[in-house]
Interface confidence: low
Protein backbone atom coordinates (compact mmCIF):
# COMPACT_ATOMS: atom_id res chain seq x y z
CA UNK A 1 0.00 0.00 0.00
CA UNK A 2 1.33 3.41 -0.96
CA UNK A 3 0.90 5.57 2.11
CA UNK A 4 2.02 8.91 0.70
CA UNK A 5 -0.17 11.77 -0.39
CA UNK A 6 0.49 14.60 -2.82
CA UNK A 7 -0.57 18.09 -1.78
CA UNK A 8 -0.83 20.58 -4.66
CA UNK A 9 -1.70 24.23 -5.17
CA UNK A 10 -4.99 22.92 -6.58
CA UNK A 11 -6.96 25.08 -8.99
CA UNK A 12 -5.17 28.35 -9.64
CA UNK A 13 -5.51 31.34 -11.93
CA UNK A 14 -2.97 33.82 -13.21
CA UNK A 15 -2.84 36.81 -15.44
CA UNK A 16 -1.83 36.62 -19.09
CA UNK A 17 1.79 37.72 -19.48
CA UNK A 18 2.52 36.98 -15.83
CA UNK A 19 4.11 34.00 -14.12
CA UNK A 20 2.92 31.27 -11.77
CA UNK A 21 4.56 28.72 -9.49
CA UNK A 22 3.30 25.14 -9.70
CA UNK A 23 3.97 23.34 -6.43
CA UNK A 24 3.44 19.78 -5.24
CA UNK A 25 4.50 18.26 -1.95
CA UNK A 26 4.74 14.56 -1.16
CA UNK A 27 4.03 13.71 2.47
CA UNK A 28 3.20 10.80 4.79
CA UNK A 29 5.76 8.43 3.32
CA UNK A 30 9.41 7.65 3.99
CA UNK A 31 9.93 6.78 0.32
CA UNK A 32 12.76 8.58 -1.43
CA UNK A 33 12.00 10.86 -4.33
CA UNK A 34 14.23 9.76 -7.20
CA UNK A 35 12.69 11.94 -9.91
CA UNK A 36 9.87 14.42 -10.42
CA UNK A 37 8.31 14.92 -13.86
CA UNK A 38 6.20 17.97 -14.67
CA UNK A 39 3.77 17.37 -17.51
CA UNK A 40 1.06 19.37 -19.26
CA UNK A 41 -1.54 17.02 -20.72
CA UNK A 42 0.74 14.76 -22.79
CA UNK A 43 3.74 17.07 -22.99
CA UNK A 44 6.78 16.79 -20.76
CA UNK A 45 7.75 20.21 -19.42
CA UNK A 46 10.61 19.38 -17.08
CA UNK A 47 12.34 16.68 -15.05
CA UNK A 48 14.11 17.02 -11.72
CA UNK A 49 16.30 13.98 -11.12
CA UNK A 50 17.93 13.31 -7.74
CA UNK A 51 21.23 12.45 -9.44
CA UNK A 52 21.24 14.62 -12.56
CA UNK A 53 19.36 17.72 -11.48
CA UNK A 54 16.95 19.62 -13.71
CA UNK A 55 16.21 19.13 -17.39
CA UNK A 56 13.79 21.49 -19.14
CA UNK A 57 12.20 20.37 -22.42
CA UNK A 58 13.72 22.41 -25.30
CA UNK A 59 10.32 23.67 -26.47
CA UNK A 60 9.68 25.23 -23.02
CA UNK A 61 13.21 26.46 -22.22
CA UNK A 62 12.34 30.14 -22.66
CA UNK A 63 9.24 30.08 -20.46
CA UNK A 64 9.88 27.50 -17.77
CA UNK A 65 12.24 27.91 -14.82
CA UNK A 66 13.13 25.19 -12.31
CA UNK A 67 12.09 25.61 -8.71
CA UNK A 68 11.54 26.71 -6.11
CA UNK A 69 12.41 23.31 -4.65
CA UNK A 70 10.79 20.62 -6.74
CA UNK A 71 8.23 23.10 -8.06
CA UNK A 72 8.12 24.72 -11.49
CA UNK A 73 7.77 28.37 -12.50
CA UNK A 74 5.86 29.18 -15.70
CA UNK A 75 6.60 32.59 -17.19
CA UNK A 76 5.14 34.79 -19.95
CA UNK A 77 1.80 33.04 -19.61
CA UNK A 78 -0.62 32.89 -22.54
CA UNK A 79 -4.28 31.88 -22.61
CA UNK A 80 -3.13 28.67 -24.30
CA UNK A 81 -1.38 27.67 -21.06
CA UNK A 82 -4.80 27.11 -19.48
CA UNK A 83 -5.23 23.42 -18.63
CA UNK A 84 -4.14 20.54 -16.46
CA UNK A 85 -0.61 20.14 -15.13
CA UNK A 86 0.71 17.03 -13.42
CA UNK A 87 3.57 16.50 -11.02
CA UNK A 88 4.67 12.87 -11.15
CA UNK A 89 6.84 11.76 -8.24
CA UNK A 90 8.92 8.67 -8.90
CA UNK A 91 9.88 7.24 -5.52
CA UNK A 92 11.80 4.34 -4.07
CA UNK A 93 10.39 2.02 -2.87
CA UNK A 94 6.75 3.16 -3.19
CA UNK A 95 6.56 3.75 -6.94
CA UNK A 96 4.76 6.65 -8.63
CA UNK A 97 2.60 9.38 -7.08
CA UNK A 98 0.75 11.90 -9.26
CA UNK A 99 -0.64 15.31 -8.35
CA UNK A 100 -2.93 17.47 -10.51
CA UNK A 101 -3.12 21.24 -10.81
CA UNK A 102 -5.59 23.15 -12.99
CA UNK A 103 -4.31 26.50 -14.24
CA UNK A 104 -6.55 29.11 -15.81
CA UNK A 105 -4.78 31.99 -17.53
CA UNK A 106 -7.04 35.06 -17.54
CA UNK A 107 -7.06 38.19 -19.65
CA UNK A 108 -5.72 41.05 -17.56
CA UNK A 109 -9.07 42.79 -17.08
CA UNK A 110 -10.73 39.58 -15.90
CA UNK A 111 -7.89 38.83 -13.50
CA UNK A 112 -8.18 42.29 -11.99
CA UNK A 113 -11.76 41.53 -10.99
CA UNK A 114 -10.61 38.54 -8.99
CA UNK A 115 -12.25 35.84 -11.11
CA UNK A 116 -11.42 32.29 -10.06
CA UNK A 117 -11.99 29.10 -11.99
CA UNK A 118 -13.20 26.29 -9.74
CA UNK A 119 -13.72 22.66 -10.62
CA UNK A 120 -16.31 21.07 -8.34
Amino acid sequence: MMTGTIETTGNISAEKGGSIILQCHLSSTTAQVTQVNWEQQDQLLAICNADLGWHISPSFKDRVAPGPGLGLTLQSLTVNDTGEYFCIYHTYPDGTYTGRIFLEVLESSVAEHGARFQIP
Partner: antibody, heavy 118, light 107 residues
Protein backbone atom coordinates in the same frame (compact mmCIF):
# COMPACT_ATOMS: atom_id res chain seq x y z
CA UNK B 1 35.57 2.93 1.64
CA UNK B 2 32.35 4.18 3.22
CA UNK B 3 32.80 5.79 6.63
CA UNK B 4 30.54 7.70 9.00
CA UNK B 5 32.81 9.21 11.63
CA UNK B 6 31.12 10.03 14.91
CA UNK B 7 31.70 12.90 17.31
CA UNK B 8 32.17 12.44 21.03
CA UNK B 9 29.17 11.79 23.23
CA UNK B 10 29.26 12.08 26.98
CA UNK B 11 27.41 12.82 30.17
CA UNK B 12 24.91 15.66 30.43
CA UNK B 13 22.67 16.76 33.28
CA UNK B 14 18.87 16.58 33.03
CA UNK B 15 17.58 19.70 31.30
CA UNK B 16 20.93 20.20 29.60
CA UNK B 17 21.93 20.28 25.94
CA UNK B 18 24.32 18.41 23.68
CA UNK B 19 25.17 18.49 19.99
CA UNK B 20 26.41 15.39 18.22
CA UNK B 21 27.64 15.03 14.68
CA UNK B 22 28.65 12.58 12.02
CA UNK B 23 31.06 13.15 9.10
CA UNK B 24 30.69 11.03 5.97
CA UNK B 25 33.26 9.86 3.46
CA UNK B 26 33.34 7.36 0.61
CA UNK B 27 29.93 8.22 -0.86
CA UNK B 28 28.00 11.17 -2.33
CA UNK B 29 26.74 12.56 0.95
CA UNK B 30 24.50 15.24 -0.62
CA UNK B 31 22.36 12.52 -2.28
CA UNK B 32 21.60 10.73 0.97
CA UNK B 33 18.70 11.16 3.32
CA UNK B 34 20.25 11.24 6.79
CA UNK B 35 18.68 9.94 9.99
CA UNK B 36 19.49 9.66 13.65
CA UNK B 37 18.43 6.45 15.38
CA UNK B 38 19.01 5.66 19.03
CA UNK B 39 19.32 2.45 20.99
CA UNK B 40 18.56 1.92 24.65
CA UNK B 41 18.01 -1.26 26.68
CA UNK B 42 14.51 -0.05 27.63
CA UNK B 43 13.23 0.92 24.19
CA UNK B 44 15.48 -0.97 21.76
CA UNK B 45 16.08 0.82 18.46
CA UNK B 46 14.12 4.03 18.00
CA UNK B 47 14.11 6.38 15.02
CA UNK B 48 14.72 9.98 16.14
CA UNK B 49 14.97 12.35 13.18
CA UNK B 50 15.48 12.63 9.44
CA UNK B 51 16.72 15.32 7.08
CA UNK B 52 16.22 15.10 3.34
CA UNK B 53 18.04 16.71 0.44
CA UNK B 54 18.70 20.18 -0.88
CA UNK B 55 16.14 19.40 -3.62
CA UNK B 56 13.59 18.78 -0.84
CA UNK B 57 14.52 22.10 0.84
CA UNK B 58 16.19 20.01 3.55
CA UNK B 59 12.82 18.85 4.86
CA UNK B 60 12.98 17.40 8.37
CA UNK B 61 10.92 14.85 10.28
CA UNK B 62 11.03 14.02 13.99
CA UNK B 63 9.76 11.39 16.36
CA UNK B 64 6.97 12.77 18.57
CA UNK B 65 9.09 12.17 21.67
CA UNK B 66 11.77 14.65 20.54
CA UNK B 67 9.73 17.23 18.60
CA UNK B 68 10.48 20.76 19.79
CA UNK B 69 13.58 19.62 21.68
CA UNK B 70 15.84 18.13 19.01
CA UNK B 71 16.98 19.70 15.75
CA UNK B 72 18.57 17.79 12.88
CA UNK B 73 20.67 19.72 10.37
CA UNK B 74 23.24 19.03 7.68
CA UNK B 75 26.09 20.77 5.91
CA UNK B 76 26.67 19.13 2.55
CA UNK B 77 29.89 21.09 2.01
CA UNK B 78 31.30 19.51 5.19
CA UNK B 79 29.59 16.16 4.49
CA UNK B 80 28.19 16.36 8.00
CA UNK B 81 24.92 15.76 9.80
CA UNK B 82 24.16 17.14 13.25
CA UNK B 83 21.70 16.57 16.07
CA UNK B 84 21.18 19.39 18.53
CA UNK B 85 19.51 17.99 21.66
CA UNK B 86 17.96 20.34 24.21
CA UNK B 87 15.93 19.82 27.41
CA UNK B 88 17.43 16.37 27.76
CA UNK B 89 15.82 13.84 30.11
CA UNK B 90 16.78 10.40 31.40
CA UNK B 91 14.66 8.83 28.64
CA UNK B 92 17.07 10.30 26.04
CA UNK B 93 19.95 8.20 27.36
CA UNK B 94 21.23 5.79 24.76
CA UNK B 95 23.55 5.12 21.86
CA UNK B 96 22.87 7.44 18.93
CA UNK B 97 23.59 6.26 15.38
CA UNK B 98 23.70 8.33 12.22
CA UNK B 99 22.24 6.53 9.23
CA UNK B 100 22.31 7.39 5.53
CA UNK B 101 19.98 6.04 2.86
CA UNK B 102 19.88 6.59 -0.90
CA UNK B 103 17.90 4.36 -3.27
CA UNK B 104 19.19 0.89 -2.40
CA UNK B 105 22.24 2.07 -0.45
CA UNK B 106 22.17 2.05 3.33
CA UNK B 107 25.00 3.06 5.68
CA UNK B 108 25.24 3.19 9.47
CA UNK B 109 27.76 4.99 11.63
CA UNK B 110 29.28 3.87 14.88
CA UNK B 111 27.23 4.68 17.96
CA UNK B 112 27.64 7.82 20.07
CA UNK B 113 26.97 7.29 23.75
CA UNK B 114 24.76 9.93 25.39
CA UNK B 115 24.02 9.64 29.12
CA UNK B 116 21.60 11.99 30.85
CA UNK B 117 22.11 11.84 34.59
CA UNK B 118 22.69 14.08 37.56
CA UNK C 1 2.57 4.43 14.83
CA UNK C 2 2.86 1.00 13.27
CA UNK C 3 3.74 -1.60 15.87
CA UNK C 4 6.21 -4.31 14.86
CA UNK C 5 6.07 -7.45 17.00
CA UNK C 6 9.25 -9.47 16.69
CA UNK C 7 9.78 -13.02 17.92
CA UNK C 8 11.49 -14.72 19.54
CA UNK C 9 13.20 -12.16 21.75
CA UNK C 10 16.13 -14.53 22.17
CA UNK C 11 17.27 -17.72 20.52
CA UNK C 12 20.08 -20.21 21.15
CA UNK C 13 21.31 -22.21 18.20
CA UNK C 14 24.34 -24.21 17.09
CA UNK C 15 26.77 -23.59 14.26
CA UNK C 16 25.39 -25.00 11.01
CA UNK C 17 21.81 -24.91 12.27
CA UNK C 18 19.06 -23.00 10.45
CA UNK C 19 16.95 -20.40 12.25
CA UNK C 20 13.96 -18.21 11.40
CA UNK C 21 13.03 -14.91 13.04
CA UNK C 22 9.64 -13.28 12.49
CA UNK C 23 8.06 -9.86 12.61
CA UNK C 24 4.36 -9.13 12.50
CA UNK C 25 3.17 -5.70 11.37
CA UNK C 26 0.29 -4.14 13.29
CA UNK C 27 -0.89 -2.39 10.10
CA UNK C 28 -0.40 -2.96 6.39
CA UNK C 29 3.18 -2.20 5.32
CA UNK C 30 3.07 -3.99 1.94
CA UNK C 31 6.64 -5.20 2.00
CA UNK C 32 8.34 -1.99 3.14
CA UNK C 33 10.45 -3.85 5.68
CA UNK C 34 14.17 -4.20 6.34
CA UNK C 35 16.17 -6.59 8.50
CA UNK C 36 19.16 -5.20 10.40
CA UNK C 37 22.01 -6.94 12.17
CA UNK C 38 23.64 -5.38 15.24
CA UNK C 39 26.96 -6.92 16.25
CA UNK C 40 28.12 -7.09 19.90
CA UNK C 41 30.41 -4.09 19.25
CA UNK C 42 27.32 -2.04 18.31
CA UNK C 43 27.92 -2.02 14.55
CA UNK C 44 24.66 -1.99 12.57
CA UNK C 45 24.28 -3.29 9.03
CA UNK C 46 21.21 -3.73 6.85
CA UNK C 47 20.85 -7.27 5.49
CA UNK C 48 17.56 -7.15 3.60
CA UNK C 49 15.22 -4.46 2.30
CA UNK C 50 11.82 -4.56 0.59
CA UNK C 51 11.10 -7.71 2.66
CA UNK C 52 13.18 -10.06 0.53
CA UNK C 53 15.93 -8.21 -1.38
CA UNK C 54 19.42 -9.06 -0.15
CA UNK C 55 21.80 -6.16 0.33
CA UNK C 56 25.04 -6.15 -1.64
CA UNK C 57 27.70 -8.30 0.02
CA UNK C 58 25.29 -10.14 2.33
CA UNK C 59 25.82 -13.93 2.24
CA UNK C 60 23.17 -16.01 0.45
CA UNK C 61 22.44 -17.95 3.63
CA UNK C 62 20.29 -14.97 4.66
CA UNK C 63 16.85 -14.73 3.11
CA UNK C 64 13.68 -12.73 3.73
CA UNK C 65 10.10 -13.65 3.10
CA UNK C 66 6.67 -12.11 3.42
CA UNK C 67 3.39 -13.88 4.13
CA UNK C 68 0.58 -11.37 4.59
CA UNK C 69 1.47 -9.21 7.56
CA UNK C 70 4.13 -11.69 8.74
CA UNK C 71 7.74 -11.19 7.70
CA UNK C 72 10.56 -13.61 8.32
CA UNK C 73 14.33 -13.68 8.21
CA UNK C 74 15.92 -17.09 7.75
CA UNK C 75 19.58 -17.94 8.20
CA UNK C 76 20.00 -21.33 6.55
CA UNK C 77 23.24 -22.45 8.17
CA UNK C 78 24.63 -20.42 11.06
CA UNK C 79 28.24 -19.27 11.02
CA UNK C 80 30.10 -17.80 13.99
CA UNK C 81 29.78 -14.20 12.74
CA UNK C 82 25.97 -14.52 12.62
CA UNK C 83 25.57 -14.49 16.39
CA UNK C 84 24.25 -10.98 16.97
CA UNK C 85 21.05 -9.01 17.53
CA UNK C 86 18.54 -8.74 14.68
CA UNK C 87 15.85 -6.11 14.17
CA UNK C 88 13.08 -5.60 11.65
CA UNK C 89 12.26 -2.07 10.53
CA UNK C 90 9.14 -0.88 8.75
CA UNK C 91 9.45 2.18 6.52
CA UNK C 92 5.96 2.24 5.02
CA UNK C 93 4.96 5.34 6.96
CA UNK C 94 6.23 7.83 9.52
CA UNK C 95 7.56 7.24 11.98
CA UNK C 96 9.71 4.30 10.90
CA UNK C 97 9.42 1.70 13.65
CA UNK C 98 11.56 -1.23 14.74
CA UNK C 99 10.74 -4.62 16.14
CA UNK C 100 11.89 -5.35 19.68
CA UNK C 101 14.89 -7.35 18.45
CA UNK C 102 16.05 -10.96 18.62
CA UNK C 103 19.25 -11.89 20.41
CA UNK C 104 20.79 -14.86 18.59
CA UNK C 105 23.22 -16.68 20.85
CA UNK C 106 25.50 -19.65 20.33
CA UNK C 107 24.38 -22.86 22.00
Amino acid sequence: EVKLEKSRGGLVQPGGSMKISCVASGFTFSNFWMNWVRHSPEKGLEWVAQIRLNSDNYATHYAESVKGRFTISRDDSKRSVYLQMNSLGAEDTGIYYCHGNFYTLDYWGQGISVTVSS
Amino acid sequence: DIQMTQSPSSLSASLGEGVTLTCRAGQEITGFLSWLQQKPDGTIKRLIYAASTLDSGVPKRFSGRRSGSDYSLTISSLESEDFADYYCLQYASYPPTFGGGTKLEIK
